[in-house]
């Protein structure tokens, strides 16, 4: 017969490691006992457990509560054991020695590797503002054993750079995502993706981009000057802009204070029934924490009688 095991067994930190040892014997052969030992413990072999066909499992004091048999059903030729709650200190070599009847003793070694999965973290860069050059949007760091892989998943155009630092049998990886901020990036997701053999699936951390900007301001409402005549009701001017953070609006009159009865409602300036004293230069001032913009318009309130009188004069002059 012969022993079947694995050259290398890999287990995730905190999980249970199955140490395989199966005797593939000829018919009629029996396994009397299986002795498990750690064989790289420095001072010779360190016994883990003894698996006896008649008396069951005996675990050595150093591994009390940490070594078990796999759950049933069990094959009498299977000397595999479970090492519970693996820690990094368990990395090393293990040997199973199988005593069989009538073939004698066999032994096999395996190497146990413990994977330490990463706990990634994402750190946003400095505040992003339109008009900046290439700027750090976010950095993502993950440390594990072996080295994790850190990539980015996003629709945003940018460049990545990564650096890694190795310790003994583990590595810390940091990847940075740089971009040239523009308003179109606002609200776009930037996702750090971390891969590692100790993770069942990639870990993803998403950061939503916020780019500060302030668009040019413009004023709507004067498209048809003929509507701005004495006595007209419901006349209004609306200031148009957009920004991140959302901007605030302020209205002033360049050639004096706002006339009485004129209502300021955020981006809108509402007029009472128009009179000639509403004529003037009005300024919309738009601002947010990033910038400020101004737009000014000239309101010229028409007197219909004055206009028709002028027309008569023109006619008579002809």
């Amino acid at each position: 017969g012969e022993l079947e095991t694995s050259d290398v067994v890999t287990v995730v930190l905190g999980q249970d490691a199955k140490l395989p040892c199966f005797y593939r014997g000829d018919s009629g052969e029996q396994v009397g006992q299986v002795a498990w030992a750690r064989v790289d413990a420095g001072e010779g072999a360190q016994e883990l457990a003894l698996l006896h066909s008649k008396y069951g499992l005996h675990v050595s004091p150093a591994y009390e509560g940490r070594v078990e048999q796999p759950p049933p059903p069990r094959n009498p030729l299977d000397g595999s054991v479970l090492l519970r709650n693996a820690v990094q200190a368990d990395e090393g070599e293990y040997e199973c020695r199988v005593s069989t009847f009538p073939a004698g003793s066999f032994q096999a070694r395996l190497r146990l590797r413990v994977l330490v999965p990463p706990l990634p973290s994402l750190n946003p860069g400095p505040a992003l503002e339109e008009g900046q050059g290439l700027t750090l949007a976010a950095s993502c760091t993950a440390e594990g054993s072996p080295a994790p892989s850190v990539t980015w998943d996003t629709e945003v155009k940018g460049t990545t750079s990564s650096r890694s630092f190795k310790h003994s049998r583990s590595a810390a990886v940091t990847s940075e995502f740089h971009l040239v901020p523009s308003r179109s990036m606002n609200g776009q997701p930037l996702t750090c993706v971390v891969s590692h053999p100790g993770l069942l699936q990639d870990q993803r951390i998403t950061h939503i981009l916020h780019v500060s900007f302030l668009a040019e301001a413009s004023v709507r409402g004067l498209e048809d000057q003929n509507l701005w005549h004495i006595g007209r009701e419901g006349a209004m001017l609306k200031c148009l802009s957009e920004g991140q953070p959302p901007p605030s609006y302020n209205w002033t009159r360049l050639d004096g204070p706002l006339p009485s009865g004129v209502r300021v409602d955020g981006d809108t300036l509402g007029f009472p029934p128009l009179t000639t004293e509403h004529s003037g230069i009005y300024v919309c001032h738009v601002s947010n924490e990033f910038s400020s913009r101004d737009s000014q318009v000239t309101v010229d309130v028409l007197d219909p009688q004055e206009d028709s009188g002028k027309q008569v004069d023109l006619v008579s002059a002809s």
Epitope: D40, E93, R111, V173
Partner: antibody
């Protein structure tokens, strides 16, 4: 700094054995596995196996089972690779390498020539 | 065993050009277990990239690695005269450890 220094070139006859040494310095010798990799002239890299300097435990590639023996002497931080029953196609440069998952440091290589 | 196939076998380029080297694996390999090495004539291999995308200590940032599953890539953004060499990929996640057959980057 980490260094792996190997023994000098060898010329052997078919059927003979060769033993190549690899002396480590600049780190704790027993803290890292040592692997052996060979490269025939004009060919690629071929993994031969590893030794755990702490325990002396070994694992050999199937192709070399029965012909290769890896040992170590922790008192002088040196690993050894012995290949027996040499054939002409064993002519190669033999490298030792330190394992930190990947192979982060390599010896300079030892040329073994098998010729009658 | 996991077989690694590198392409192309030889890459003829001029200094300053971009080099893209491919490594395909016969079975899926975790990116954490893939490395790239550079070997110049008469020298031992040197670790360039580990964990598929992480540059080893002292490796210039013109070298970058990427990929996952069965497809991995080594990119040299602008070839310097000292970059003309043979490049090997390696998987170290399962036994036996295996290498690709190598890609030679030569001066055009």
């Amino acid at each position: 700094q980490v260094q792996l220094v190997q023994s000098g070139a060898e010329v052997k006859k078919p059927g003979a054995s060769v033993k190549v040494s690899c002396k480590a310095s600049g780190y704790t010798f027993t803290g890292y596995y040592i692997h052996w990799v060979r490269q025939a002239p004009g060919q690629g890299l071929e993994w031969m196996g590893w030794i755990n300097p702490n325990s002396g435990g070994t694992n050999y590639a199937q192709k070399f089972q029965g012909r290769v023996t890896m040992t170590r002497d922790t008192s002088i931080s040196t690993a050894y690779m012995e290949l027996s029953r040499l054939r002409s196609d064993d002519t190669a440069v033999y490298y030792c390498a330190r394992e930190d998952w990947d192979f982060d440091y390599w010896g300079q290589g030892t040329l073994v020539t098998v010729s009658s | 065993e996991i077989v690694l196939t590198q392409s192309p076998g030889t890459l003829s380029l001029s200094p300053g050009e971009r080099a893209t080297l491919s490594c395909r694996t016969s079975q899926s390999v975790s990116s954490s277990y893939l490395a790239w090495y550079q070997q110049k004539p008469g020298q031992a291999p040197r670790l360039l990239i580990y964990g598929a995308s992480n540059r080893a200590t002292g490796i210039p940032d013109r070298f970058s690695g990427s990929g996952s599953g069965t497809d991995f890539t080594l990119t040299i953004s602008r070839l310097e005269p000292e970059d003309f060499a043979v490049y090997y990929c390696q998987q170290y996640g399962s036994s036996p450890i295996t290498f690709g057959q190598g890609t030679k980057v030569e001066i055009k």
